[in-house]
Interface confidence: medium
């Protein structure tokens, strides 16, 4: 079986005018999954972001998480990127709607 | 910084159990799952198993009837466990960390461990 | 299973030379899990590139990967005397997850 993931970007405000985005994806199977940042359709560096590791959400499902710090006012220049059983898709950050879901 | 050690037996007898441990330091069980890979001598790499963060385990099904993978967190240990062993699993068992955002390639290494089998 | 080869199986260059290894899948295999890894005479190997053209962390430049689907690459671009090693690739897309048997990159 396939169950592809939710797909959720946050915004959180910290100090000296960046921000932490987070890209959570969530109920998804099965486990094997990519997540990353982007900046400009580019991945970023694997040592400017953080991930959790692919853990089980209690329906079946896995759930998993990547963050990375960015320049307050250039969230249009990033993506989330994911990948999940030959599906794939990118998830945008907005500086307004601070919430942004999508399920494919 | 980044460490993982395997140690056990160097020889263990044909239709014994090989029993592996892999010490880390550096980074959390809780947070890093590991990998078992072996390398029979003068050969290539051929991947065992690995165990995730809360414990669930993935197995090459060519040694899934025999092998066991667990972690103890507060010894900061996992393990490997190869039953019913033949002279062909003689080999240098190496555990590797899994690495976050390296989409499960392995980023930390321990330097190996020979095992023999024989009688 | 997927089946990685190598090729070819051993290559023999000299210093300052550019070294192109070849990992072919038996079926294919996503760009983000086909990762390559060196290893010296006993030592154990390590991460070199991952997800196909990544370098993991204190990779100089001169390495890069590239490719999709079933055929990969990795290009030393120079090489110089420590890049001589066994070179393999490894894909996590399917289970089991399988090595490529490795192509031995050795001084001319």
């Known amino acids: 079986r396939t169950v592809p993931p939710m797909v959720n970007v946050t915004c959180s405000e910290v100090s000296e005018g960046n921000i932490t985005v987070t890209c959570r994806a969530s109920s998804f199977y099965p486990r094997n999954i990519t997540l990353t940042w982007r900046q400009d359709g580019v991945s970023l560096s694997h040592n400017t972001q953080q991930w959790g590791d692919v853990l089980p959400d209690g329906n079946g499902t896995y759930q998993t998480w990547v963050a990375t710090r960015i320049r307050q006012g250039e969230e249009q220049r990033f993506t989330c990127y994911m990948e999940h059983s030959g599906n794939h898709g990118t998830h945008p950050v907005s500086g307004k709607v601070l919430v942004l879901q999508s399920h494919w | 910084q980044v460490q993982l050690q395997e140690s056990g037996p160097g020889l263990v007898k044909p239709s014994e159990t090989l029993s592996l441990t892999c010490t880390v330091s550096?980074?959390?069980?809780?947070?890093?799952?590991v990998h078992w890979i072996r390398q029979p001598p003068g050969k290539g790499l051929e991947w065992i198993g690995m165990?995730?963060?809360?414990?669930?385990?993935d197995y090459n099904a060519a040694f899934i009837s025999r092998v066991t993978i667990s972690v103890d967190t507060s010894k900061n240990q996992f393990s490997l466990k190869l039953s019913s062993v033949t002279a062909a699993d003689t080999a240098v068992y190496y555990c590797?960390?899994?690495?976050?955002?390296?989409?499960?390639?392995?980023?930390?290494w321990g330097q190996g461990t020979l095992v023999t089998v024989s009688s | 299973e997927i089946v990685l080869t190598q090729s070819p199986g051993t290559l023999s260059l000299s210093p300052g030379e550019r070294a192109t290894l070849s990992c072919t899948a038996s079926?294919?295999?996503?760009?983000?899990?086909l990762h390559w890894y060196q290893q010296k005479p006993g030592q154990a190997p390590r991460l070199l590139i991952y997800?196909?053209?990544n370098l993991a962390s204190g990779i100089p430049d001169r390495f890069s990967g590239s490719g999709s689907g079933t055929d990969f690459t990795l290009t030393i671009s120079r090489l110089e005397p420590e890049d001589f090693a066994v070179y393999y690739c490894?894909?996590?897309?399917?289970?089991?997850?399988?090595f490529g048997q490795g192509t031995k990159l050795e001084i001319k």
């Open positions: 590797a960390r899994k690495g976050h955002g390296y989409y499960y390639a392995m980023d930390y």
């Open positions: 079926s294919s295999v996503s760009s983000s899990y």
């Open positions: 165990i995730w963060t809360d414990g669930t385990t």
């Open positions: 490894h894909q996590y897309h399917r289970s089991p997850f399988t």
């Open positions: 550096g980074f959390s069980l809780t947070t890093y799952g």
């Open positions: 997800s196909t053209s």
